[in-house]
Interface confidence: medium
Amino acid sequence: RKIPKVGHTFFQKPESCPPVPGGSMKLDIGIINENQRVSMSRNIESRSTSPWNYTVTWDPNRYPSEVVQAQCRNLGCINAQGKEDISMNSVPIQQETLVVRRKHQGCSVSFQLEKVLVTVGCTCVTPVIHHVQ
Amino acid sequence: GITIPRNPGCPNSEDKNFPRTVMVNLNIHNRNTNTNPKRSSDYYNRSTSPWNLHRNEDPERYPSVIWEAKCRHLGCINADGNVDYHMNSVPIQQEILVLRREPPHCPNSFRLEKILVSVGCTCVTPIVHHVA
């Protein structure tokens, strides 16, 4: 899928748009809101009934190079007694983000946008039970 | 910027960092992943900390539609189907990168933007602060 053109009538292409070669787009990777911080509740990954761990993946040819992935610690959920209850399921919650991939072909370098699926954390769900006829 | 290993066989191999501005192919790799969380799973309804999904639309952004989660309850759903306030539903937030049209309305010129989205909710033990 290509990036959609802006279709609304009031979004006429302004005169000030930079010239871009066909089939490509200009991308400024100086990130807007670079310094904003997630103000998530304290260590919810440990306090959750479906706790998770974090792993940092590193790829020097990706921007950003670091992507943090969560993995659920258990198949079941943690009950009030602190024990794993396998009648419930810990499942990953995922979110798409964009990254820029650098590709080397010989000595030339090209850049490609890529959608990456990030596991953000886990939640505890009631399982779907499939009854056998 | 990001440092990359040099290829000694190439001339002018000092570009260890990503340049500030790059020309990118319009086609997006892995573009076919499902962007509607309602269609991809029903965890939002089956979770002990269920959430509603709200559509956030902005034509100046790619992707133009982002789904935001909002926890349905302050507590969590217990085995009886009631909301139990000994536990708390909290949002799981994530910073993601999107494209912002820059200058505005331009069809093929973008800047990366970091935004904070609530992806879903999880059930946690509360931190209780008692007053002395």
Epitope: - | R72, L74, V83, V124
Partner: antibody, heavy 118, light 112 residues
Amino acid sequence: QVQLKESGPALVAPSQSLSFTCTISGFSLSSYGVHWVRQPPGKGLEWLVVIWSDGTTTYNSALKSRLSISKDNSKSQVFLKMNSLQTDDTAMYYCARDGYYIYTMDYWGQGTSVTVSS
Amino acid sequence: DVVMTQTPLSLPVSLGDQASISCRSSQSLVHSNGNTYLHWYLQRPGQSPKLLIYKVSNRFSGVPDRFSGSGSGTDFTLKISRVEAEDLGLYFCSQGTHAPLTFGAGTKLELN
């Protein structure tokens, strides 16, 4: 506009049970929760129970054994049943809409007065 | 249960005065999600309660800007900058962070 209206018997004998109905308009029960709150004459407010938009419930544990709440989304009605009434259950009973899961009662009914007396 | 303590229980005022009502909770009202579910209601004589302020400081729609809420943790205040006749009645604070939802005993705003 948003409206809630309570109905129920005005006089009940001790040890009897009591049923209230809250009829709503201007919003959907599949989108909002509804609380019940009571106020004894000349006193403060006491929260009883809430039924959330998804049908889940939360009771005041002190009264849970005597209360039962349900709803009919299609009829825009919420029902509250209270058992084993005593004289100290004499109060004005209100239903109120929850302001999107934040335990904020943004719109209230006018209340229905109940006297428990033999 | 979380105990909500309102002071004063009675507040005599003259029209045009500033009025201030305090509400203190027996434990912090900061929820795990970061929000503080402390709300203020006004019950005029012979009427049902009306929402004034939700989540500490947010005025509900149609509430005049002479009403303001502030505070954090366990200590909260409702201020009326210039009391008008329609402001007289019983003011309740309420918390929704911990079940069961609880109310303060009320503060009666009345004319001197």
